[in-house]
């Protein structure tokens, strides 16, 4: 029951988190005009990952997309990539976790398969959350750097060189949405990984021990002689002894961090 709750909660938290990551990625307020020196301005500037906007006092808002790809800063491109990777991984994770939910029965899917899927989705959520947090943090760092660098800027207009104070930008709402959403996705992923450990079927009155034969990598189960490949655990992760025999969980190949780069 606790496992089902943990898994369900992990799914819901991750779902909210991924929705937040998508929202943050689409939002225009990644950076907003710093109003420290001029708290009441008739023209307010703000920027997102995809376009920059200007809101006038009149209520008229004009947004212009970044139609160039090569002309954009590498950091902005990196942030876009991180957020998109986060969304894609999160979406795949959600899809996998739906089928992994204990409360949903799909054909004759074994608990071992559900455990694997739960773990996979959990790892995907963790990586997704980390991508979002990294993306937002890189952008925030970029803002801080630019904030102190922006003093005065020169623009060439129709009237020649014009001295104009460069608009300084500070953290926008999207950054906070992104940080929170990334954190939620990360927490949801951890919960899914925790739920995975308890998803395996209850232990029987005997221990399932894998005997590694010299010729073939086949695990023999006493009391049924059911062959298995050793992938996809059926029992709880308990060490019996440190000799040649080990539980099936320990033979399981977990995805390494390089699988998701």
């Amino acid at each position: 029951m606790a496992v089902t709750a943990c898994q369900g909660l992990g799914f819901v938290v991750s779902l909210i988190g991924i929705a937040g990551i998508i929202a943050a990625t689409c939002m225009d307020q990644w950076s907003t005009q710093d109003l420290y020196n001029n708290p009441v301005t008739a023209v307010f500037n703000y920027q997102g990952l995809w376009r920059s906007c200007v809101r006038e006092s009149s209520g008229f808002t004009e947004c212009r997309g970044y139609f160039t790809l090569l002309g954009l800063p590498a950091m902005l491109q990196a942030v876009r990539a991180l957020m998109i990777v986060g969304i894609v991984l999160g979406a795949i994770g959600l899809l996998v976790s739906i089928f992994a939910l204990k409360c949903i029965r799909i054909g004759s899917m074994e608990d071992s398969a559900k455990a694997n899927m739960t773990l996979t989705s959990g790892i995907m959520f963790i990586v997704s959350g980390l991508c979002a947090i990294a993306g937002v943090s890189v952008f925030a760092n970029m803002l801080v750097t630019n904030f102190w660098m922006s003093t005065a800027n020169m623009y060439t207009g129709m009237g020649g060189m014009v001295q104009t104070v460069q608009t300084r930008y500070t953290f926008g709402a999207a950054l906070f949405v992104g940080w929170v959403a990334g954190g939620l996705t990360l927490i949801g992923g951890v919960m899914m990984c925790i739920a995975c450990r308890g998803l395996a079927p209850e232990e029987t009155n005997y221990k399932a021990v894998s005997y590694h034969a010299s010729g073939h990598s086949v695990a023999y189960k006493p009391g049924g002689f059911k062959a298995s490949t050793g992938f996809g655990s059926n029992t709880k992760n308990k060490k019996i002894y440190d000799g040649g025999a080990r539980t099936e969980d320990e033979v399981q190949s977990y995805p390494s961090k390089h699988d998701y780069v």
Epitope: Q33, N38, V40, T41, A42, V43, N45, Y46, Q47, S52, C53, V54, E56, S57, S58, G59, F60, E62, R64, N153, Y155, G157, V162, Q163, T164, V165, Q166, T167
Partner: antibody, heavy 118, light 113 residues
Framework: QVQLVQSGAEVKKPGASVKVSCKAS????????INWVRQATGQGLEWIGE????????YYSEKFRGRVTLTADTSISTAYMELSSLRSEDTAVYYC???????????WDQGTTVTVSS | DIVMTQSPSSLAVSLGEMATINCKSS????????????LTWYQQKPGQPPKLLIY???TRESGVPDRFSGSGSGTDFTLTISSLQAEDVAVYYC?????????FGQGTKLERK
Amino acid sequence: QVQLVQSGAEVKKPGASVKVSCKASGYTFTSYVINWVRQATGQGLEWIGEIHPRGGNTYYSEKFRGRVTLTADTSISTAYMELSSLRSEDTAVYYCAILRRGNAMDYWDQGTTVTVSS
Amino acid sequence: DIVMTQSPSSLAVSLGEMATINCKSSQSLLNSGNQRNYLTWYQQKPGQPPKLLIYWASTRESGVPDRFSGSGSGTDFTLTISSLQAEDVAVYYCQNSYNYPYTFGQGTKLERK
């Protein structure tokens, strides 16, 4: 068609207050910001302040801060400008205007003449 | 506050001739966010309220004849009437639309020679 109609001319004594109304029609009242500008006889234009009817946010010129109050009644699509502690130099034509794209004052009413005389 | 200075204060031009009015602001009116200059031009005839001519320094308001044009960027702006018509005799004002308080130039009185 957008129309702004102001209240009639006012004659006030120094120290008194005046409340000028500006009734809007032909558009959704809360959609546009209303600005108030005054013009003394033979003088230039002077911005008083603006009100955002949707939220009631107001911005005032420092010169008038504390003496002017801008309000809006969305139920009757009317904006008000109240100027207190009137002085003779407040004698002017008071205009209300709609702020549009580019923060430009697009539609103006015919103005209300306020005369401050003892 | 942004100070708007217009020159000349009065101008006499023959009908059909070009009229040029200048406006200088104490601070740049160029917004870096959209690269637009927040300067507005108005025309006011005696006994009438001002009429919007040009916003964003060079964008003509709908219904304004194309003989009126605005140019300039940053702090220096110009209103040009390519061929003066009798109905163009009026007072012209430039206005800072960029920052509060919105400030107007003192006006340029355009007369026919």
